[in-house]
Interface confidence: low
């Protein structure tokens, strides 16, 4: 004879466990049904009646099969420096991640609790280590022979252009200016004569992104005053 399928609630055989999507209720001493994701246990099972499940109420969720009396609260709405990458539904929590130009200064189990703007390296400093989702930009002074003339969270130090004759030597925050001895092509009347470098700049250059117009936001956590990191802007 085939084994009879037990319907919940049922008393498990001694030494055996309840089946998948069931739990053992200590009070009833029975195997009872779990509630599906998006639901919670409204009434616990007894020896004669199974678990009564109910939908999670507004702004709450359960992600797993469960027998919790109340659903978990979704996190608060994403702040202005964040993007909602996963909405709050009855089956999943809201996930907030930092928007472009920001990094996660304080993470939580899923998503980010506190975003901060990526550091901008000021002129004379370039990006040594770019920002990631969870780490800030690291700036470094431009080494001799390189420069950065931008305030940017992405620009690296670039090599000075090489001139036949140098008009103004380059420094950490300015490219070298070349003296043009003989124009390589004729100029239109009234046109400005741009210096012609011998060689084009090396392949290290990166396009400078448009500056983001990020609204200034106050941090959610108290942060004491601290001097800006070397090479970063103090805005």
């Amino acid at each position: 004879l085939p084994a009879q399928v037990a319907f919940t609630p049922y008393a498990p055989e001694p030494g055996s466990t309840c089946r998948l999507r069931e739990y053992y209720d200590q009070t009833a001493q029975m195997c009872c049904s779990k509630c599906s994701p998006g639901q919670h246990a409204k009434v616990f099972c007894t020896k004669t009646s199974d678990t009564v499940c109910d939908s999670c109420e507004d702004s709450t969720y359960t992600q797993l099969w469960n027998w919790v009396p109340e659903c978990l609260s979704c996190g608060s709405r994403c702040s202005s420096d964040q993007v909602e990458t996963q909405a709050c539904t009855r089956e999943q929590n809201r996930i907030c991640t930092c928007r472009p130009g920001w990094y996660c200064a304080l993470s939580k189990q899923e998503g980010c609790r506190l975003c901060a703007p990526l550091r901008k390296c000021r002129p004379g400093f370039g990006v040594a280590r770019p920002g990631t989702e969870t780490s800030d930009v690291v700036c470094k002074p431009c080494a001799p022979g390189t420069f950065s003339n931008t305030t940017s969270s992405t620009d690296i130090c670039r090599p000075h252009q090489i001139c036949n004759v140098v008009a103004i030597p380059g420094n950490a925050s300015m490219d070298a200016v070349c003296t043009s001895t003989s124009p390589t092509r004729s100029m239109a009347p009234g046109a400005v004569h741009l210096p012609q470098p011998v060689s084009t700049r090396s392949q290290h250059t990166q396009p400078t992104p448009e500056p983001s117009t990020a609204p200034s936001t106050s941090f959610l956590l108290p942060m004491g005053p601290s001097p800006p990191a070397e090479g970063s802007t103090g805005d």
Epitope: S55, E57, D58, S59, T60, R77, S80, C88
Partner: antibody, heavy 116, light 110 residues
Amino acid sequence: QSLEESGGRLVTPGTPLTLTCTVSGIDLSTYAMIWVRQAPGKGLEYIGFIRPGGSAWYASWAKGRFTISKTSTTVDREITSPTTEDTATYFCATYDTYGYGDTRLWGPGTLVTVSS
Amino acid sequence: AYDMTQTPASVEVAVGGTVTIKCQASESIFSYLAWYQQKPGQRPKLLIYYASTLASGVPSRFKGSGSGTQFTLTISGVECADAATYYCQQGYDFSAVDNVFGGGTEVVVK
């Protein structure tokens, strides 16, 4: 889908009064309800709201003065000790907390007059 | 927290004209703002939600804009039926606030 307030009447100051919002075609286990009042010739004033699970939140000025509770088909708002300043039309409205924070469905309102 | 300041308190406009009502939140409510129309003796009627989305059945002459703390309701091609009081309402936080509504703007149509 409709809402209807009831219980509005003339009361003397200090006499507790309960207003009831009866819903039809609305599942109060998925919608929150908000109470708003409007004194004669004045603007809309938020009193508080009750979530589907039964927890209530109040405007800062309304805490301790009002109590909001619910059953499966009604939402009650009790004013514990009315004063003449509580004379107003009282509205209930649905508030979908999965939505955009707007109240789409309003009851017609019930008038409460507090006078000695 | 989240105090809503609405201006002007009253405005007069000719039929066919345009009226602009502004609503300012004391702190950012992102786009969680609704606009309502209320006529004397009637319940408020939802016009616009989520700052700029027209509610069902509302004529396209009503337009909402803004986000963060500054919001605007514009009624263009005003009709006599638009004479009413208009309210803004923040829907971002209903807990521990004084009022979720602006003070209202009375629109008088000449």
